[in-house]
Structures are given as C-alpha cells and as structure tokens.
C-alpha cells in the first residue's frame, strides 16, 4: 500500500489537520495537572501519574498503552537524617549550618514530599577539612589549579558552582584531583538574570533556592547496578563496589545565600583572574582554608542519603502504522521530576500529551499513519536516564532493526527568545523545511516563518540565511536511541537569548520553585512558545511516520563530516613536530569523507529519480536512509565507554551535556602534551583515525547502490 | 513581609549601659546580618556594626571596639546591641538595619529605631 | 575608612522640576567582584531611612521610576526627574564596598 492508501485523507492535509487540532489551552491544561504535586522518581505519586496517562493516552486513541517497569537504584536523603553542611570551630562546635530546604513558594506551603536539595547517588559521609574554591571545577578549571597555581585539592572540601558543564563531571574531576568532598552552589553570575526580580517575583533563582540533580558518570549504562541490560524481574546485579559511575566522594548543593556564608572567609591565593569572580560580594580566593581571624575554622558536610533499588514505570504508548508497522518512530519523554517540574519536564510531558491527543483525533476519523509511532512517558531521567536506557536495553534488538528516528520531548522551553534544535545532520532539512512551514510565536515576525525568527535570531555560524543546529551531547533520553543504538535523533525547545543571558540553563532549574506559576506568569502566559514546540515536535514525528520517503538527507551529513574532519586535524597540527615524528596522517580520513561526499551526492540523485510506486525499491531506499546513522555506530565502543557507540558524535568527557564531534580522536588528542608516553599516545591518535576513517568509509558503502 | 522591630526608649546615666533589641520577623533570620546605626540629633548615619546570626561572627567600626557588643538569639530571630560606658554625646536614635543579601547588598530594611539618652 | 562626601547640603526644589545630588567617595567602590556597592537611602521627616538605589542604579522594590542613579569608580549622582512633594527628607549616599560610610546628608526641600 502507499501511504495514500493507508489514510482518506491527502498527506498534505493529514499534516494540517494535525498541526491545527494542537491546542496551546489544553498544553496549559495538561501542564496545571501535572505540576500540583512532586512526582519524583521512585515514588507513589509518580506511580500514580504513570497509571493517569496511561488511561488518557487510551482515550485518546492510541492502539495500546502498557506501562513497563524495572528496578533500578535511585538515591534519596535520609529523612529522619537530614543533609546538611556546617562552619565548626577548633573545639568541633558548628558555629554555621547549611539551610535543611527551601522555603516553599507561595501557595505550596502545605505539600508534602517535597525532596529537599541533595545530590543523588553522593555516598554518605562527614568529611571536614579545609575548603578550596575551583570555579565551575571543569577540566581546565584543575589545571589552572593544579598546574598554574600548584595548589593540592587532595585531602580538601572544593566548592564548585554550578554551570558550564554537567554536575557529574564536575565531580568526577574533584575525585580525580584527590577532593573528599564536593559543595555545589549556584552562582547569581550564572543563575540570576540582571534586572529580573527572584521568584515569586520573577523568574529569578533567590538566595535559598538550591538546584538538585545526579551526580553520575554513567557514560550511557543505565541502572548503575545492571549495564547492557534491562533491569528486570530475573536481572543479576552487581554489588554496589562494581556499580557503574557512583561517585566516591560525598557531595551536597546549596544556594547562594549560604555559599556567601562559605565564600566570604576564603583566603589563601588570590583568583586566577576575572572569570573565577561570580557576582557574590566575596573575595572568590581559591584557598586552601579561611583567612586570617577563621583559620581555624573548618567545613564539614554530613551526608546521609541511601542508594536504593527501587521500581520505575515508562507508559509507552503505540499506534500502529498501516504500511510499515515494522518501522518506529518514537516521541519519548519523561515524567518524573525533581519537585514540581514546571518547566522540567512537565512543560515537555504536555506537550507530548497534546501531540498524542491530536494524533489520536486523526485515528479517530479514520486515519493512520504510514510507520508506527510509539510514545514514552520515560520514569527515572532525573536519576540517569534510567527509565529510557532501561527499556532501550530491553528492546534493543527490536530498536536496531526497526528504529527510523527518535524525538526527544523534555523540557518544551528554557527561554522564550527563540527556537533552539539539536539533532543528527539527516534530520537537518526536515527541520529547515518544518520551520519553513510554521507561523513564528515571536513578537515582531508576525505573519512571519518560524524558520525566519529562527534565522534571524539565532544563525548558523557556517552558512549565511541558515538557523543554528547544534550537535546532540547527552544528559536526555535520546542518549540510548542515539549514542548507543544509532537512531537518528533530534529534540527541540524554545530558548533563551545566549548572547545576552549568560547563566547556564535557566535560574530555577531543579529548583522547588520550578512550579507551573513560574511558566504561566513569566515564561509563556499564552503558552505560544508550548504550541510552537508542540507542532515542531509533532511535526517532525508526523512527517518521520507519514512521508512516503524518509525524509533523512544524507548529504548533510557528508558536508559535516568534512567540517569535523577539518577541525580535529586542526587541532592535531596544533602539534606538527609530533604528527612529522609519529607520521600521524589524516589522509584516511579525508579521503573517506570525499567517497562519503561522492556516495551520498549519488544517492540523493537515485532518490529522486526512483520509482516509487514500487513497495520493494521504495522500502530498498528507505533502509539505506534508516540505517545510515547505525553504520555510524562501532560494536566496540568508545575507548573506556562501551555505550557510547557513535564513532561521529559522542558526549564531551569533559561535559556530558556537550557532543563532540570525532570523540574518540579528539579525547586521544586531548591534553596530549602533557601524555607521559608521549609514543604511546600518539599510536593511539593513529588508531583512532583509523577507526573514524574505516567508519566513515562503511557507512559510505551503505549508501552505494545495491548491487 | 519583613519587619524589625525595635525595643523602646531607653534614658541612662553616663556610665551606665544599654542594651537594645530588635525582633526581626518575616524571613529566615539565619541568611541575613543585621546592622547596628546610630544618628545623633540632627546629624548623619553612622555605623557601629553588624552581626551574622548565621554564624554569630561580628564586625565592629573602630570607634566603638571594645565599647560596643553584638549577640543574636536565633531562636527568638533577635539581634542585641549593647553599648557600655555611655556618655552624653551618645544620645542618638539606634537603628538596626537588615543587611541585604545579594542583589542589594545594602540596608534593605529598618528597624523604627529606639531613642537613647544619656543624662545625669 | 572611606569618607563619602555628599553635595549639595541642602536642595530646595519645585515640584514637577528635576533635582540632583552629588556623592564623591574617597577611593575607588569597585569591589575585586567588579560590583560597586553605592547605594542611596531616604529619610523622611520623622521616619526611618529607607533604600531607595542599590549598586549605583538599581531601583529598590516600590521605588518609582522617576529616582535614578549613575556614576561609577568615585563620582556618583542620584537623580529625581519630576520632584513630588512626597520627596522631601534627608538623602543619604553609602557605600558597601569597605566597612559601611555613609555621607552627610542632602536636605530636600519644597521651595
């Protein structure tokens, strides 16, 4: 059957009538109800929230709706034990305490179960000592210590604020440096916007609002305790010695009230420079220990939070596609929260419930689309994206072969400046063409595109008249589909302007005062900005499971892969000695770019020139589309990181949020000069040319014609 | 919304002491140090010092060292500022002032100040 | 300590007409954060004083726009555009930066 055949309806107007019934009153609606309560991870009230949208998702119209669930180890405080942080004297007295919670916002005084500020999966301890100040405590924030400065953060508490990089690899590096403890706080430099008022005044993190959030480094396993595999009722797990990624050290986040009380005693050296200064009045001294009068002063943390294995539950909706149901395209996002997720992930979740109610109006009237479209309601995302990678691992086999694309729905908005996509090149003309298509929400483009706002708001760096795409990193719930799997993947939401807001993600984040109000008085009172997404999102989906050819262009791919090419060599050269002595080329590489370049530009010209009345081509060359992102993937993995298969892309090892292009070239050539076996390291960069040249070349040859 | 509020009118004999309390109310006492000021009849604002309730740590301007003592009392969210050794010229009206944290970073908030004075 | 040095002493002005005052500090207020904590407070007659400007121009909560504050490194200015009756009282200048000073005053009167 085409996929006219499959509907009563033209695909043209399957589109519009799908776009058309996305209303932003009921992501308003959906938002409300699922933000009045916490729903964290592991809890009854999320157990709940699992079962409520599992029977709305059915009357919508959705073919089935089963909820699936695994037992992972989560993190919580001590409840009758609480977390805390003290200032004590030479006499052991604590003379300061951190605060125990965040003062509720107005109107939720009342609610129980708010989880107070912790970092999940910290060990327990009571370490004291001396404090040192390590900036965001990125790489280069301990090599500026350790190297420039020669100061020793072994046997120290560092303080670390927030921002930059992902909290995990922040203290994956203070373990690295010899820390035995970490406090995390957030800086108004980074968490408060200039001439914004604090909530509940405005959308402005005050001095008592504390960010939570993992501290892992998982690199894509999962549950720590059952890597490669679904975490089920029969699952052998590892002891928590062998677990995957826990931190080693204790560690507890504060806000910037009592990180004042921290900081302004800090003495010892100097800041490096400027760009250690945050906007607190205090001296930013790095350390080690308090000046003068408080030298005898010490920091200790009491950290008694328990790791545990406890049930999580994924709603996973499928509508079945009438042409090819063996093919997927899925929109996940999560549902658990850190408190009350206004923004995350709720003002996700509802959009995914509206896209999932307008697809289900469409099935209704008698339409279906060409692909299956599952939907996933994720559990555990704030605790490692534990609820997707689990249900992944469990469906992996079923993924590889029959995975089209995947569509991210977290958070829908972190601003309300512009649109800001992240995705694989294959999907970047869907995008362009999508945006093409979409009225802007913007104020002053009206009548106007939103590919026009986009552009014109955010370009592209390389091509003039062009939005910026980003490359996928991690810290979301494509990560699996992605990293591990190879499935093409992309995610977009509404952000903030970068160049004039430099704080890092948004100042409420993870916060309790992440609430619903935060979004309707502040955010998106029309909720436009939740209706754009919602039809960007559930545009991509439609035309991922509806077009008749897969509308993947693979010569975006080819015109980034010359682009990283050209960067990782550039950096290489930054060593010219080395590259002549250890005779490190990238001809390799090149040249399987250019038979890449080549393939692909031949392919395109197939695509268009095909018969496509023939089901057995057509399906031919729509499996040449899809399986171009797994040729991507290396079985081996990563250097270190099994699950992080992607030879093209990986996240940072420096910031799991960022993707990186060539990982495992760039981290061979990372720090390479300072390499004790200098011979060593550069046979390992030769490798990993070898690799990345060999992939590219494969995945080149899956586009040549068959036979 | 946040309040202090001050103890009432104090008249002492040179030589003597007073202690001044001020009940703060409507935040949490802990975040934020409380100031000490005096204004004398028809003069400026002058600073006598400041207490960290969080901690306990105080700072004092170098006229009043030695003369001038700080204490808090976190369980009842007060502040006391006692001044020994009075003389006539510090009549004045005391204030506490709630020092703000960040943004401010200034006295964002007033005691209605407590008038001493000092008399044979 | 850092003296700050207010001009003019008094201010007689008009309603509806605008008005400035002058603070000059001894040294620089430019904290090692790049922040310059001068601030500017109101006392009415009678009252006790009250924030009006935090960090050189920032209006405190319910202060109305018709109050601005400029200046940098030592020279600082506190502008009304528009007087209103209501305005009257002692204007103070202060700075955080060191151990708290405050200047002398600026009397501000209706005509």
């Known amino acids: 059957k085409s996929s006219n055949e499959a509907t009563n309806i033209t695909p043209k107007h399957n589109m519009k009538a799908f776009l058309d019934e996305l209303k932003a009153e009921n992501i308003k609606k959906f938002l409300y109800n699922f933000t009045q309560i916490p729903h964290l991870a592991g809890t009854e009230q999320n157990f709940q929230l699992a079962k409520q949208i599992q029977s709305q998702w059915k009357e919508f119209g959705l073919d089935s709706v089963e909820l699936a669930h695994y037992d992972v180890l989560l993190s919580y405080p001590n409840k009758t034990h609480p977390n805390y942080i003290s200032i004590i004297n030479e006499d052991g007295n604590e003379i300061f305490n951190t605060s125990l919670f965040e003062p509720p916002p107005p109107g939720y005084e009342n609610v129980s179960d708010i989880v107070p500020p912790f970092s999940a999966f910290s060990p327990q301890g009571m370490p004291e000592g001396d404090l040192v100040y390590v900036n965001y405590a990125r790489t280069e924030d301990f090599f500026k210590l350790e190297r420039d400065m020669k100061i020793n953060c072994s046997g120290k508490i560092v303080i670390a604020r927030y921002g930059k990089v992902f909290r995990g690899n922040k203290v994956k590096n203070a373990q690295l440096a010899g820390a035995k403890g970490v406090i995390l706080y957030s800086d108004p430099a980074d968490y408060f916007a200039p001439g914004v008022k604090s909530y509940p005044d405005g959308w402005n993190l005050p001095g008592g609002g504390v960010q939570r959030g993992n501290i892992l480094n998982l690199n894509g396993a999962g549950d720590p305790l059952t890597p490669g595999y679904p975490a089920n009722e029969y699952a052998y797990r590892r002891g928590i010695a062998e677990a995957v990624g826990l931190p080693s050290i204790p560690v507890h986040p504060i806000g910037y009230y009592d990180a004042q009380k921290l900081l302004e005693k800090m003495g010892g050296s100097a800041p490096p420079d400027s760009s250690w200064r945050g906007s607190l009045k205090v001296p930013y001294n790095v350390g080690p220990g308090f000046t003068g009068n408080f030298s005898t002063q010490k920091v200790k943390m009491h950290i008694h939070s328990t790791n545990e294995v406890t049930r999580i539950y994924n709603v996973i909706g499928t509508l079945r596609g009438a042409v090819e149901p063996d093919r997927y395209v899925i929109l996940g996002g999560h549902r658990d929260s850190w408190v009350f997720g206004g923004i995350d992930p709720q003002s996700g979740a509802a959009v995914v419930h509206e896209i999932v109610r307008s697809f289900g109006t469409l099935k209704k009237e008698g339409w279906r689309p060409r692909r299956t479209i599952l939907f996933a309601s994720w559990d555990a995302e704030e605790f490692g994206l534990l609820g997707s990678t689990e249900w992944a691992e469990e469906n992996s086999r079923l993924l590889q072969e029959r995975g089209v694309a995947y569509i991210n729905a977290d958070s829908s908005i972190e601003g309300n400046y512009t649109l800001r996509v992240d995705c694989t090149p294959l999907m970047y003309s869907l995008v362009h063409n999508l945006t093409k298509e979409l009225k802007s929400p913007d104020e002053g483009f009206e009548g106007k595109s939103l590919y026009e706002s986009w552009t014109k708001k955010s370009p592209s760096p390389e091509f003039s008249g062009m939005p910026r795409i980003s490359k996928l990193g991690s810290g979301n719930d494509f990560e699996v589909f992605f990293q591990r799997l190879g499935i093409a993947s992309g995610r977009a939401r509404y952000t903030k302007n970068w160049e004039t807001n430099k704080f890092s993600g948004y100042p409420l984040y993870h916060s309790v005062y992440e609430t619903y109000e935060l979004v309707e008085k502040f955010y998106d009172p029309m909720f436009k900005y939740h209706l754009t997404v919602a039809q960007v999102r559930g545009g991509m989906v439609f035309e991922l499971a509806n077009s008749i050819v897969l509308p993947f262009d693979c010569r975006d791919y080819a015109v980034v892969l010359r682009k990283y090419a050209d960067k990782i060599y550039s950096i290489s050269m930054k060593h010219p000695q080395e590259m002549k002595t250890y005779s490190v080329s990238f001809d390799s590489l090149f040249s399987a770019v250019k038979n890449f370049t080549e393939i692909a530009s031949k392919f395109s010209e197939r695509l268009q020139d095909f018969d496509k009345s023939n089901p057995i081509v057509l399906r031919m060359m729509n499996d040449q589309l899809m399986f171009l992102e797994r040729a991507f993937i290396d079985p081996l993995g990563l250097p270190d990181r099994p699950f992080y298969r992607h030879v093209i892309y990986a996240p940072s090892s420096h910031n799991k949020y960022a993707g990186e292009s060539f990982p495992g070239i760039y981290d061979a050539l990372f720090d390479i000069e300072s390499k004790v076996d200098p011979s060593k390291a550069w046979g390992e960069v030769k490798r990993q040319i070898y690799v990345a040249a060999f992939t590219v070349q494969a995945a080149a040859e899956t586009l040549s014609e068959v036979a | 919304q946040v309040q202090l509020v001050q103890s009432g009118a104090e008249v002492k004999k040179p030589g003597a002491s007073v202690k001044v309390s001020c009940k703060a109310s409507g935040y949490t006492f802990t975040y934020f140090d409380i100031n000490w000021l005096r204004q004398a009849p028809g003069q400026g604002l002058e600073w006598m010092g400041g207490?960290?309730?969080?901690?306990?740590?105080?700072n004092y301007a170098q006229k009043f060292q030695g003369r001038v003592t700080l204490t808090i009392d976190t369980s009842t969210s007060t502040a006391y500022m006692e001044l020994s050794s009075l003389r006539s010229e510090d009549t004045a009206v005391y204030y506490c002032?709630?020092?703000?944290?960040?943004?401010?970073?200034?006295?964002?908030?007033w005691g209605q100040g407590t008038l001493v004075t000092v008399s044979s | 300590d850092i003296v700050m040095t207010q001009s003019p002493l008094s201010l007689p002005v008009t309603p509806g007409e605008p008005a400035s005052i002058s603070c000059r500090s001894s040294q620089s207020l430019v904290h090692s954060n790049g922040q310059t904590y001068l601030h500017w407070y109101l006392q009415k007659p009678g009252q006790s004083p009250q924030l009006l400007i935090y960090t050189v121009s920032n209006r405190f909560s319910g202060v109305p726009d018709r109050f601005s504050g400029s200046g940098s490194g030592t020279d600082f200015t506190l502008k009304i555009s528009r007087v209103e009756a209501e305005d009257v009282g002692v204007y103070y200048c202060?700075?955080?930066?060191?151990?708290?000073?405050f200047g002398g005053g600026t009397k501000v009167e209706i005509k």
């Open positions: 202060s700075q955080s930066t060191h151990v708290p000073t």
């Open positions: 002032a709630r020092d703000g944290n960040f943004p401010y970073y200034a006295m964002d908030s």
């Open positions: 207490i960290s309730p969080g901690d306990g740590n105080t």
